[in-house]
């Protein structure tokens, strides 16, 4: 469930603190409820960037697990189509710390509406 997603995010946050990854990532910091699935897709795609850049097994495994969890939760809600949402590339670029904080925020939005 989404609580496990948050714990994976916290784990990623802890893991990257010991590394020096200075990537900037497309970050949706003001998610409109009608675009939350689109925003989630952008967050997950950017997480894969973190995984690539880190070259770390623990981060890699945690990112994959997080994507598997999110996929399964969202698939159980059926196909959700959203329109008029920003493309990932249109989002503001932020550092990893801000990116992860915004990610936790959107997951909490899913928890509050489930």
């Amino acid at each position: 469930n989404w609580v496990n997603v948050i714990s994976d995010l916290k784990k990623i946050e802890d893991l990257i603190q010991s590394m020096h990854i200075d990537a900037t990532l497309y970050t949706e910091s003001d998610v409109h409820p009608s675009c939350k699935v689109t925003a989630m897709k952008c967050f997950l795609l950017e997480l894969q960037v973190i995984s690539h850049e880190s070259g770390d097994t623990d981060i890699h495994d945690t990112v994959e697990n997080l994507i598997i969890l999110a996929n399964n939760i969202l698939s159980s809600n059926g196909n959700i189509t959203e329109s008029g949402c920003k493309e990932c590339e249109e989002l503001e670029e932020k550092n990893i710390k801000e990116f992860l904080q915004s990610f936790v925020h959107i997951v909490q939005m899913f928890i509050n509406t489930s």
Epitope: K41, D58, H60, D61, E64, I67, S75
Partner: antibody, heavy 122, light 112 residues
Framework: EVQLVESGGGLVQPGGSLRLSCAAS????????MSWVRQAPGKGLEWVAT????????YYPDSVKGRFTISRDNSKNTLYLQMNSLRAEDTAVYYC???????????????WGQGTLVTVSS | DVVMTQSPLSLPVTLGQPASISCRSS???????????LEWYQQRPGQSPRLLIY???NRFSGVPDRFSGSGSGTDFTLKISRVEAEDVGVYYC?????????FGQGTKLEIK
């Protein structure tokens, strides 16, 4: 050439336990997630378990959840499947397979072992 | 769970002729990141399964170019442009977009 060699199969009574092993060679074992897939005699393939590269994350279908445990020892390049509370319907050839990462190539079991037969019967 | 349904279950083909196998999923297997994790595996008689196609249409290394994959959403197809004797066996589609990962029932290809 990538090699995966399963062992540990055999005849076991219903309710019994068995541990399968899969010895990996000719690739960096710790860089790959791994899976077990089984095939009952004359039947199709069924996914049984997957484990992440580091071993922290495991995935199972409901048919084996709580009875089977996938694990790995990266220092020994070996994958395991601990099978408890075995049932007649667990009778199958068990294959181990190397799994390409979602992040690097998009999920796929690219190399398979030759399989080991598990027979559950009284 | 995602159910994968293959057709036909048996496929008699003349050597040199094309063959086509269909695979339908009970729901879309496009994942949240937009990827479709659909593979095709071949199992020759008495052998272990072998990866042919991954992510719908990507041929695995060493797989002859007479094999091709296509499709999207819930409908997928494996095509063999000209069947050869070594193609005899059972073909399985497999989805690993969503846990539990699931195989189709298999399609047995035989020579007429």
């Amino acid at each position: 050439e990538v090699q995966l060699v399963e062992s540990g199969g055999g005849l076991v009574q219903p309710g019994g336990s068995l541990r399968l092993s899969c010895a990996a060679s000719e690739f960096t074992f710790s860089n790959y997630a791994m899976s077990w897939v089984r095939q009952a005699p004359g039947k199709g393939l069924e996914w049984v378990a997957t484990i992440s590269r580091g071993g922290d994350y495991t995935y199972y279908p409901d048919s084996v959840k709580g009875r089977f445990t996938i694990s790995r020892d990266n220092s020994k390049n070996t994958l395991y499947l601990q099978m408890n509370s075995l049932r007649a319907e667990d009778t199958a050839v068990y294959y181990c397979a190397r799994r390409v990462s979602m992040i690097t190539g998009g999920w796929a079991m690219d190399y398979w072992g030759q399989g080991t037969l598990v027979t559950v019967s009284s | 769970d995602v159910v994968m349904t293959q057709s036909p279950l048996s496929l008699p083909v003349t050597l040199g002729q094309p063959a086509s196998i269909s695979c339908r999923s009970s729901q879309s297997i496009v994942d949240i990141t937009g990827n479709t994790y659909l593979e095709w595996y071949q199992q020759r008689p008495g052998q272990s399964p072998r990866l042919l196609i991954y992510k719908v249409f990507n041929r695995f290394s060493g797989v002859p170019d007479r094999f091709s994959g296509s499709g999207s959403g819930t409908d997928f197809t494996l095509k063999i442009s000209r069947v050869e004797a070594e193609d005899v066996g059972v073909y399985y589609c497999f989805q690993d977009s969503f846990v539990p990962y699931t195989f189709g029932q298999g399609t047995k290809l035989e020579i007429k």
